[in-house]
């Protein structure tokens, strides 16, 4: 039949009926059956008569927002095919499962900006295939465990922002299809471990503007598909790896406007796919070496509006994919004015912004490692000088932002204008001279080259550098640094240790007129370090500053030493040959002392030559294997470090059983001759020698002579009775050894029967 006309109080467009903002207190009675989208928003409806929806078979979208409903209405027969129901900005206080049971096709339900105070597990029954549920801007204080379980098969988006939720129960959401969860602007203080387990498909989690101060280990466990995590405007003071455990697919992490003061080096090990990390508006004061090293996929790092004053060399090591680094509004002037190597590792960086960092000068190597940089923003810094070469290696630089009216237009700046023009980089450079007076207010591009002169040196110039030194623990030391300047501008002095300013430095500053040139002032600063400890070790540098800029000295290293002292000293030992000698020696000191051994004052000794010497560094033990008599002597252990050396001695006594050096041989002599028997014995202790003839001790006559050590027996005027078996007995504490010699005595010399001569 013919299409039914539009309802009297409404306007029509296609299959949409707009009855919004008409001040209606009840449904229009003539709703056409062809209606697919019905707008009843901005009226005064406090209840809905289900009968009014009896003949609306095509109805899919119902807008009832901004009315005065106090409960989820029934739409009668239409309930079963309504797909989207908008009930925001009413006065609904609770949601009952019974009210929703009839909505068999409902996919979008907006209940935001109502007066709902709690969500119980009876609120959302199984049945309605809700994909998007908006509960934002209510007064929800508690979420009952399993409150949304009835929607587990369908829910994709859940908005709970702007409520009063203070706590999330562990495993609060069993919604395996959910991709977006919005918990902005609640009152959550703590995220417990496993809170979000059950959200296997979650991609975006919004937790900004809560009061979260702690993320317990495993807080986000189970969110293995999550790409974006918003934690802005909370009270976090740190990020540790445990709290990020399980975020293996995370691409964006927003942590701005917290109170994070430190980045832990191992804090990022579980989110190595991170592409963007936002840490702006926190309390960071330093970036330590390799503190972000695990973020090899990071593309954007935003660190603006912190108080970063120290960037360690190698702080960005590992960030090989980083393209954008935002360091605006920090205090990293020192990094740009002096340090080199702060940006090493940023091989892919194309944009670096350093707006508003109180940078007064740009050092030659400030940007070393950033050869691929395309965009560099140094605006908002009262730059006075830029050293030659500072930007030169950036062959791809397309945009350089400088805005300063503080330039010291002297000979050292002369290179800059033509270089900027030649590289076509002057478009974003507003650079005006402040000095000398004759050029004040002129653009550096309009100053003729011959006007960039160095008639004086306004910026301080270091003339005495602090010197590397070594000190013993407990001693007082001092570093001296002097600078000269032709300016009468007040001079300030600072000392840095390992690139960080020493806040309570004990320094002595003085000034005098330079002898050679009456107009030049020489400024000296002395840093006193009293009773130094190991904690004083490091690299010290002075920074001398006046209105025209800062000058940085070389870095002088302080090494604090302690003389070696023995913890184990070698003891005198007495051992037998062929056994193992063991000498102990250990010492402490700073630096760790080296231990060296000597024998009798030399380093070339038998055990060393014959590879029988073994030093066990970890055991502090020195071994000599298969000990020989030659190994006996005085062994010295020397412990040496750069502070000095100490020695300790031990005597090695080698005991040896007696033995003959030269064999004792049988002898034949004639009567009247002299015979000598030698018992040349060795052993330690030296053996006592006793002579026997036969089985009895030798009876000595005036013809028998013994050397004092009994080693040589001489018998003169041999007689026949001297013949026999002579025994040399060698004895010491280790044992006794015997050697024999048969002495044969022939008659006096004369002719034998066979014609041979006797003798």
């Amino acid at each position: 039949g013919p299409r039914a006309p539009c309802a009297a109080a409404c306007t029509c467009a296609g299959d949409s009926l707009d009855c919004g903002g008409r001040g209606l207190a009840a449904l229009p009675g003539d709703l056409p059956s062809w209606t697919r989208s019905l707008n009843l928003s901005y009226n005064k409806l406090s209840e809905i008569d289900p009968a009014g929806f009896e003949d609306l078979p095509n109805l899919q979208e119902v807008y009832l927002n901004n009315n005065e409903l106090t409960a989820v209405p029934s739409l009668g027969a239409a309930s079963s095919h309504v797909v989207s129901l908008f009930l925001q900005h009413n006065k609904i206080r609770s949601v009952e499962g019974s009210q929703l049971k009839a909505y068999l096709s409902l996919e979008v339900l907006d209940l935001s900006l109502n007066n709902i105070t709690e969500v119980r597990n009876t609120c959302f029954p199984h049945g309605p295939p809700i994909k998007e549920l908006n509960l934002a801007g209510n007064r929800i204080g508690t979420l009952e465990l399993g409150a949304f379980d009835g929607l587990s098969r369908s829910l994709l988006t859940l908005r709970l922002s702007k409520n009063r939720i203070t706590q999330l129960p562990v495993r609060a959401f069993k919604l395996p299809r959910l991709t977006q969860l919005d918990l902005n602007r609640n009152r959550i203080r703590l995220i417990e471990g496993l809170t979000f387990q059950g959200l296997n498909s979650l991609e975006v989690l919004k937790l900004q503007r809560n009061n979260i101060s702690k993320l317990t280990d495993g807080a986000f466990w189970g969110l293995s598909k999550m790409h974006v995590l918003h934690l802005e405007y909370n009270s976090l003071v740190e990020v540790n790896s445990g709290s990020l455990y399980g975020l293996t697919a995370l691409h964006q992490l927003h942590l701005s406007n917290n109170s994070i003061a430190r980045i832990h080096r191992k804090g990022w090990s579980f989110c190595q796919k991170l592409h963007e990390l936002v840490l702006s508006f926190n309390n960071l004061t330093r970036l330590d070496e390799e503190s972000l090293a695990e973020l090899s996929s990071l593309s954007v790092l935003r660190l603006s509006h912190n108080s970063i004053s120290h960037i360690a060399e190698g702080a960005f090591k590992g960030l090989r994919s980083l393209r954008v680094l935002d360091l605006d509004h920090n205090e990293i002037s020192g990094t740009i004015e002096d340090t080199s190597g702060a940006f090493s590792g940023l091989d892919s960086l194309s944009k670096l912004t350093l707006f508003g960092n109180k940078i007064k000068s740009v050092a030659k190597r400030a940007f070393s490692g950033l050869e691929g940089l395309e965009h560099l923003n140094l605006g908002g810094n009262a730059i006075r000088s830029v050293q030659f070469d500072a930007f030169v290696k950036m062959k791809n630089l397309k945009e350089l932002h400088i805005s300063s009216d503080s330039f010291l237009c002297d000979c050292q700046l002369k290179w800059l204008p033509p270089w900027l023009i030649g590289r076509m980089l002057q478009a974003f450079v507003t650079a005006t001279c402040a000095h000398p007076e004759s050029l004040k207010g002129q653009s550096i591009f309009s100053v003729p080259p011959e006007s960039f002169v160095c008639d004086d040196f306004l910026k301080p110039q270091i003339i005495t550098q602090p010197e590397t030194t070594m000190a013993m623990v407990g001693k007082d030391i001092r570093f001296t640094c002097s600078a000269a300047s032709s300016s009468s501008s007040p001079m300030t002095f600072a000392w840095k240790k390992d690139n960080e300013v020493l806040t309570n430095a004990d320094m002595e500053n003085f000034v005098h007129v330079h002898a050679q040139d009456g107009e030049v002032m020489e400024y000296t600063t002395i840093l006193h370090l009293r009773q130094v400890t190991f904690g004083h070790e490091g690299r010290y540098q002075c920074v001398i500053t006046n209105h025209f800029g800062s000058t940085y000295s070389h870095k002088a290293r302080l090494t604090v030493n302690v003389l070696p002292s023995f913890t184990k000293t070698p003891h005198d030992i007495t051992i037998r040959t062929t056994t193992v000698a063991r000498l102990e020696c250990a010492a402490t000191g700073h630096p760790n002392p080296q231990i060296a051994w000597q024998k009798d004052g030399g380093t070339d000794f038998p055990a060393a030559r014959e590879r029988r010497m073994h030093v066990m560094p970890d055991d502090d033990v020195f071994f000599i294997t298969d000990v020989k008599i030659d190994d006996a002597g005085v062994y010295s252990c020397t412990a040496q470090n750069s502070a000095g050396s100490i020695s300790a001695n031990a005597t090695l006594t080698v005991l040896e059983t007696p033995s003959l050096v030269v064999p004792l041989e049988d002898r034949v002599v004639s009567v009247g001759e002299t015979v000598a028997l030698q018992c040349k014995a060795t052993g330690n202790p030296p053996p006592r020698i006793t002579w026997f003839k036969g089985d009895r001790p030798l009876s000595l006559t005036e013809r028998h002579h013994l050397t004092p050590d009994n080693q040589l027996l001489v018998v003169q005027n041999v007689v026949a009775e001297d013949a026999g078996r002579y025994t040399c007995e060698m004895s010491n504490t280790l044992g006794t050894e015997r050697a024999h010699s048969q002495l044969s005595v022939l008659p006096a010399a004369g002719c034998r029967k066979d014609g041979t001569t006797v003798g």
């Epitope: 030659k364 030659f388 070469d389 000979c411 002369k414 290179w415 030649g422 160095c454």
Partner: antibody, heavy 121, light 111 residues
């Protein structure tokens, strides 16, 4: 009056070494960039190396990189050029030159009289 | 082959005006000031012009320098016999990170 006096030139065999010195006077040596420039017999000028005053940053021509080392001793007002692994093509008069100011891109406003280095076997 | 290109020779009669050109690129002349050096036979070079067009004290105003884009030129007016010398242009090259000279121009004053 600015004066630059080179010394240390002479005959050396290929592969050998030589150290040139340049004694400066008449100006505050420690404030200026200094360079070595050479001129082969009958040829044009070739910049060899330069050194900055403050941090002693060094710069080298590709032809000498890795073989020559420039240094300065501000306390002695002296510039040096250590030349190793010398080649026949290093034969030239070596001039010591003072930069107009402290930056490497400044012109050379004073030159020494030069010292001859001959590399030949 | 020099980075800066100069004509190998130039000549003129006394009183004439002679111009010597020097051509480079954006990494040298295009980004830097140009200098000119005069080397009289058997002597060390001498700075003649710096900062494109500035004369050190003692250099006659017959010598003048100019620059446009990546080219520079030295003009000598009122040519004199004592001007017979080799002339070199020079500047810093940011690509090579070093100072570069032209190949030199031998100026002959014809009698």
């Amino acid at each position: 009056e600015v004066q630059l006096l080179e010394s240390g030139g002479g005959l050396v065999q290929p592969g050998g070494s030589l150290r040139l010195s340049c004694a400066a006077s008449g100006f505050t040596f420690s404030n200026y960039y200094m360079s070595w420039v050479r001129q082969a017999p009958g040829k044009g000028l070739e910049w060899v190396s330069g050194i900055s005053p403050g941090d002693s940053s060094t710069y080298y021509a590709d032809s000498v990189k890795g073989r020559f080392t420039i240094s300065r001793d501000n306390s002695k007002n002296t510039l040096y050029l250590q030349m190793n692994s010398l080649r026949a093509e290093d034969t030239a008069v070596y001039y010591c030159a003072k930069g107009l100011y402290s930056n490497p891109n400044e012109p050379f406003d004073y030159w020494g009289q030069g010292t001859l280095v001959t590399v030949s076997s | 082959q020099s980075v800066l290109t100069q004509p190998p020779s130039a000549s003129g009669t006394p009183g004439q005006r002679v111009t010597i050109s020097c051509t480079g690129s954006s990494s040298n002349i295009g980004s830097n000031y140009v200098s000119w050096y005069q080397q009289l036979p058997g002597t060390a070079p001498k700075l003649l012009i710096y900062d494109d067009s500035q004369r050190p004290s003692g250099v006659p105003d017959r010598f003048s320098g100019s620059k446009s884009g990546t080219s520079a030129s030295l003009a000598i007016s009122g040519l004199r016999s004592e001007d017979e010398a080799d002339y070199y242009c020079g500047t810093w090259d940011y690509s090579l990170n070093g100072y570069v000279f032209g190949g030199g121009t031998k100026l002959t004053v014809l009698r």
